[in-house]
Amino acid sequence: EAHKSEIAHRFNDLGEGHFKGLVLITLSQHLQKSPFEEHVKLVNEVTDFAKACVADESAQNCGKAIATLFGDKVCAIPSLRETYGELADCCAKEDPDRVECFLQHKDDNPNLPPFERPEPEALCTAFKENNDRFIGHYLYEVSRRHPYFYAPELLYYAEKYKNALTECCEAADKAACLTPKLDAIKEKALVSSAQQRLKCASLQKFGERAFKAWSVARLSQKFPKAEFAEISTIVTSLTKVTKECCHGDLLECADDRQELAKYMCEHQDSISSKLKECCVKPTLQKAHCILEIQRDELPTELPDLAVDFVEDKEVCKNFAEAKDVFLGTFLYEYSRRHPEYSIGMLLRIAKGYEAKLEKCCAEADPHACYAKVFDELQPLIDEPKKLVQQNCELFDKLGEYGFQNALAVRYTQKAPQVSTPTLVEYARKLGSVGTKCCSLPETERLSCTENYLALILNRLCILHEKTPVSERVTKCCTESLVNRRPCFSALHVDETYVPKPFHADSFTFHADICTLPEKEKQVKKQMALVELVKHKPKASEEQMKTVMGDFAAFLKKCCDADNKEACFTEDGPKLVAKCQATLA
């Protein structure tokens, strides 16, 4: 139903606390450089205005769209051009163009210092002084660094953060209580951020159909007992919610998400028995619980897929009469039977099936043409299975650090034009997938690996789009969302790349490396490794092993020496010469 005042409606639905949090997230995600205080001032102004509209929905400006109200607020900031440069040009546009313009200025990689965690004592002091302000600051800091973070989920993490501090700030050993809790929140929040970024990229770059297909696959895996019609209903609502959040309409998104959770709880009998435990929880926890829900058991006696999708003489008729519904049903039926497959695999299989029907249904004897379709789709299952098996074997053999090094070499050979810090960052992220997934049972390994890789490659694609350096990366990123991972896997040494001239500076180390924390030490060594590959992209595995071995021995020797700097000064050039000889 239409409301006289949209902002009053959302304020009433969400309540003041969540309303203020969402306004703060909206502002922080769009105005990523502004100080916290400035945002707090704007949040209070917007909240006061919303309250006035609740009191009288016909009051001046209360009838305006929320996006327009936000845009007007942003454009009234006196220092806007000074702080944000050409973002201020958006203010000359009319909505909805102004909204689109603001979105285009969101920065996925803002030049902000890492969000450092203060010492537990300092944390607790600040929290006790003013916990609302403290949590507001958390929302602000996370939002400006993650401009597409799923806003209602961020409110959930803020609540978890608050609960951890409430409990641990009273504990005798604050650090022992807080550290594991905050580490867990941080790790989960980062994954949540990456998941939402992939959803937004899917919608923005590949359209609604791509996102809906992704959602059908995921929900069919989680709720295999639900009918296709029920899955479709949820997918339609979920698409609306996700579009709103990706578009920056966070109040609408959070409210509609609440509605979707309510709908699912009211219809849990026809969706999943697992919803019971979620539906008794309060709003934020309920929606989060549904998002993270364990998959339901498969219904027994499911007929063979071939019955409806191969043997049935009506396949082409059904395909012609309602292509998307028919393919959606195929994706649903396939996904609910295969919870162990990744979303990417399921979508590639559905795409393969669609392509087969496109070809066969145009023939005089379609059935003879598509009769063996499942055999022909088997490579789409075998390829990722084999890849995961090989990579997990390598991970088990080398450990996380060694596996990261192998990936650093592999990805530098694929895209040597990419900057060294970026290649190291992605090699480390890709390597950590081994730690996350390789120890899981066989049934979960495959989906864990490919689903995580999709998140990592999406981030790589987003940053590469901002400053493109490799045509091959652009091609893999833009041609097809579901084929991104296979596309990157299929890349080998870039034959067009002109090797980088040798710079001794890239391989010069000093005694300071010895005192660095282990992680930073590894990063420095991996930077050198990437530089080495850029210098000699076709070096053999044996040559690389030799060089890395010499390198490790050199570091150990010099870091153990009494006069470390002298050792680095003397042995460094010898090591460089030896490496050049090995790679010659």
């Epitope: 003489k313 249904c361 004897d365």
Partner: nanobody, 115 residues
Framework: DVQLVESGGGVVQPGGSLRLSCAAS????????MSWVRQAPGKGPEWVSS????????LYADSVKGRFTISRDNSKNTLYLQMNSLRPEDTALYYC????????SGQGTLVTVSS
């Protein structure tokens, strides 16, 4: 919505000819092979003939081979069945279908071969 409208049936003497038409709409006609299916009174559906989307490939049931010719005009989204040397056993309701389907979408057109 997919629509198939058959026409051209009628009463004809044994040895005579008829040309059936099927006007298609609501889908990409050229992307689909089309078939003619018939159903004699009191019997199940029987496949008669099929043609590929481009019109280059055709298939016929043994019972009609050499007598019937299937064709299509993709510019008009229309399927045809030229029936020559008709026999009494060809009497049936004829309808067109998408792909190899045997189920009817249109109302069909009745062909009666009788002296």
């Amino acid at each position: 919505d997919v629509q198939l409208v058959e026409s051209g049936g009628g009463v004809v003497q044994p040895g005579g000819s008829l040309r059936l038409s099927c006007a298609a709409s609501g889908f990409t006609f050229t992307s689909f092979g089309m078939s003619w299916v018939r159903q004699a009174p009191g019997k199940g559906p029987e496949w008669v003939s099929s043609i590929s989307g481009s019109g280059s490939d055709t298939l016929y049931a043994d019972s009609v081979k050499g007598r019937f010719t299937i064709s299509r005009d993709n510019s008009k989204n229309t399927l045809y069945l030229q029936m020559n040397s008709l026999r009494p056993e060809d009497t049936a309701l004829y309808y067109c279908t998408i792909g190899g389907s045997l189920s009817r979408s249109g109302q069909g057109t009745l062909v009666t071969v009788s002296s």
